[in-house]
Amino acid sequence: AAMGSCSKEYRMLLGQLQKQTDLMQDTSRLLDPYIRIQGLDIPKLREHCRESPGAFPSEETLRGLGRRGFLQTLNATLGCVLHRLADLEQHLPKAQDLERSGLNIEDLEKLQMARPNVLGLRNNVYCMAQLLDNSDMTEPTKAGRGTPQPPTPTPTSDVFQRKLEGCSFLRGYHRFMHSVGRIFSKWGESPNRSRR
């Protein structure tokens, strides 16, 4: 849905959530550009870019939640993701620096689209919660009560280490979105059932 407005049509809203998560699990939209821009696109360095265990809820955990609980967890996790993406963006090279080093400006543009995309998804998560009559959900623009803090990068002066941590975070993010997409794809044609 357009930011700030909510569709009352369950299947259209679910379709939008399915489409957004479908696109967000695609590594070519975020992880791959990040790896190229940060100079990690070398087999030996790529090996170090592994997902940190426990950084995101597992698919098994998500599947054990009812629809409302799932949406609340997703909303909270996306809040963390927004904080972390903002942190990553601060450490990206500037456009002119990219051009000087012969890197693709389109990669930077893809990375800069990540936060607006997450905001759009979060807005639709909020709308779906409204549609399922979930009064506990905080609005996507506000910090939620009990929202976990974003995973804090290890304090380090090592720029390379920070790049690897960003890489690990994005790998986990794509895996998480894949899990979320699989769950949304199982949601049926009717909004009535609270558990799958």
């Epitope: 930011m3 407005s5 569709s7 299947r11 259209m12 679910l14 939008q16 044609e189």
Partner: antibody, heavy 120, light 106 residues
Framework: QVQLKQSGPGLVQPSQSLSITCTVS????????VHWVRQSPGKGLEWLGV???????DYNAAFMSRLSITKDNSRSQVFFKMNSLQADDTAIYYC??????????????WGTGTTVTVSS | QIVLTQSPTIMSASPGEKVTMTCSGS?????MYWYQEKPGSSPRLLIE???NLASGVPARFSGSGSGTSYSLTISRMEAEDAATYYC?????????FGSGTKLEIK
């Protein structure tokens, strides 16, 4: 190869109903939604409605009172019926396939089209 | 409902020329979809999710945009690209189409 072939009358009397059958091949109606769109010189392309893989339907509010979409999965057929046609319902009517099993409201393959003229 | 306004309504281009047409929404939309229609044929999906080429579509086609402003570009016009192009959104109910841009070959 995915195909949607349409059959239906070319001429409909005013106030009568229009029935079109969309017969699909290359995919199963249990896996994909089928939408209906019409195209007229005056109003351009208009989305009319959809029947999803599980059989539920969504209709454009402007046509809801006179539109019905049903299907027979075993015969790979979708049935479109619109009542009380008037001259401004003259258009080409298309069935079109949703691109995957999710609730996607756009169309990756379109039917052959049925040209409908409403006239006495 | 969201109204999509396409411009120009009609345009012509020479073979090899770069072509850009736009689609403007009355409200913000998440993604835009583009279709190509040739006389006597059914519409064909060209671009999905704003910038992804649909299956079998030549790489000279590209899409971009966000919010209320989207565009379709043909990097080098070819004779077979003469057609009418429609944009479509489904961010808001009901799905709606633009009124089309007719592209002719010079």
């Amino acid at each position: 190869q995915v195909q949607l072939k349409q059959s239906g009358p070319g001429l409909v009397q005013p106030s009568q109903s229009l029935s079109i059958t969309c017969t699909v091949s290359g995919f199963s109606l249990t896996n994909y939604g089928v939408h209906w769109v019409r195209q007229s010189p005056g109003k351009g392309l208009e989305w009319l409605g959809v029947i999803w893989r599980g059989g539920s339907t969504d209709y454009n509010a402007a046509f809801m009172s006179r539109l019905s979409i049903t299907k027979d999965n075993s015969r790979s057929q979708v049935f479109f019926k619109m009542n009380s046609l008037q001259a401004d319902d003259t258009a080409i009517y298309y069935c079109a396939k949703s691109p995957n099993s999710n609730f996607y409201w756009y169309f990756d393959v379109w039917g052959t089209g049925t040209t409908v003229t409403v006239s006495s | 409902q969201i109204v999509l306004t396409q411009s120009p309504t009609i345009m012509s281009a020479s073979p090899g020329e770069k072509v850009t047409m736009t689609c403007s929404g009355s409200s913000s939309v998440s993604y835009m979809y583009w279709y190509q229609e040739k006389p006597g044929s059914s519409p064909r999906l060209l671009i999905e999710d704003t910038s992804n080429l649909a299956s079998g579509v030549p790489a000279r086609f590209s899409g971009s945009g966000s919010g209320t402003s989207y565009s379709l570009t043909i990097s080098r016009m070819e004779a077979e690209d003469a057609a009418t192009y429609y944009c479509q959104q489904w961010s808001s109910y009901p799905p709606t189409f633009g009124s089309g841009t007719k592209l002719e070959i010079k």
